[in-house]
Amino acid sequence: TPEVWVQVQMEATELSSFTVHCGFLGPGSISLVTVSWGGPDGAGGTKLAVLHPELGTRQWAPARQARWETQSSISLALEDSGASSPFANTTFCCKFASFPEGSWESCGSLPPSSDPGLSAPPTPVPILRAD
């Protein structure tokens, strides 16, 4: 069964910077990746980035840069411009559309006790689903 992993990490050098890392474990080719925050895509989440393996990548504030790290994993850098840190308690979800498997989504957040540079474990939360 395909699986999506999500890691959320605070940058050690800049406490206002976060990076979301997501990956797809499974056969098939990825046709699109969507990163949302505040909940899953289509279920209250707001899209922060859309990445297509060949057409390009797009991101919207507070996301700074979306990029492919490998053929099956992506990263999204976020810049927290506010005085408080809304990212700390936020859920980030990554949805991978792949052929022929369909869509798979998983969510993660920064662990409450995170030290800079530490990341959430790459374990999918129960929002893993196939469309």
Epitope: G42, K47, V50, E54, L55, G56, R58, W60, W68, T70
Partner: antibody, heavy 114, light 113 residues
Framework: EVQLQQSGPEVVKPGASVKISCKAS????????INWVKQRHGKSLEWIGD????????NYNQKFKGKATLTVDKSSGTAFMGLRSLTSEDSAVYYC???????WGQGTTLTVSS | DIVMTQSPSSLNVSAGEKVTMSCKSS????????????LAWYQQKPGQPPKLLIY???TRESGVPDRFTGSGSGTDFTLTISSVQAEDLALYYC?????????FGGGTKLEIK
């Protein structure tokens, strides 16, 4: 497949503002992420910016900041582009296109003339 | 901004001929992570909006005839039409799909003798 239907031609006076629309129909999950592109007569294409329907987030080409304002009404699947302080340089065909430019509207011709 | 330079600016060929047009970018369009080039080609016929032909430098959009072939990597790209048809009369644009602003080339005008 996404279909994009743009509003009709506009003739406006210098200094005025205008708002053109782009209605999307079809149903894939990146339908309503919309780009706007300018094409002056006999010239190449210029990307103006894009808009995210989830939160109204925008990305602009620096060249068009202050000139164009991009908005979207997610409920109707309609994107809008406002253009202000119009001059003859703004006379062009304006296109909307889907997120990765794989579907385009038919274009809206804007003529700025006194 | 990434500058896209196309050549030649116009081509005048007979039906059945092979045509090659060039597009050069001022910065690499190769994504090192997935080894994909974010370069697209568009065809614009008179009075019509542009139509996506090729993306990822070499992948044909669905429904595009196989006489259209895209190639290249990094900063140098080519669009080839193996046997030009009368309906290929159009302007052809390349586009940087790598980074904002998503700049277009000046275009190559294809005319049929």
């Amino acid at each position: 497949e996404v279909q994009l239907q743009q509003s009709g031609p506009e003739v406006v006076k210098p200094g005025a503002s205008v708002k053109i629309s782009c209605k999307a129909s079809g149903n894939t999950f990146t339908d309503y992420f919309i780009n706007w592109v300018k094409q002056r007569h006999g010239k190449s294409l210029e990307w103006i910016g894009d808009v995210n329907p989830d939160n109204g987030g925008t990305n602009y080409n620096q060249k068009f900041k202050g000139k164009a304002t991009l908005t979207v009404d997610k409920s109707s699947g309609t994107a809008f582009m406002g253009l202000r302080s119009l001059t003859s340089e703004d006379s062009a065909v304006y296109y909307c296109a889907t997120l990765f430019f794989d579907s385009w509207g038919q274009g809206t011709t804007l003529t700025v003339s006194s | 901004d990434i500058v896209m330079t196309q050549s030649p600016s116009s081509l005048n060929v007979s039906a059945g001929e092979k045509v090659t047009m060039s597009c050069k970018s001022s910065q690499s369009l190769l994504n090192s992570g997935n080894q994909k080039n974010y370069l697209a080609w568009y065809q614009q016929k008179p009075g019509q909006p542009p139509k996506l032909l090729i993306y990822g430098a070499s992948t044909r959009e669905s429904g595009v005839p196989d006489r259209f072939t895209g190639s290249g990597s990094g900063t140098d790209f080519t669009l080839t039409i193996s046997s030009v048809q009368a309906e290929d009369l159009a302007l052809y644009y390349c586009q940087n799909a790598h980074s904002s602003p998503y700049t277009f080339g000046g275009g190559t005008k294809l005319e049929i003798k």
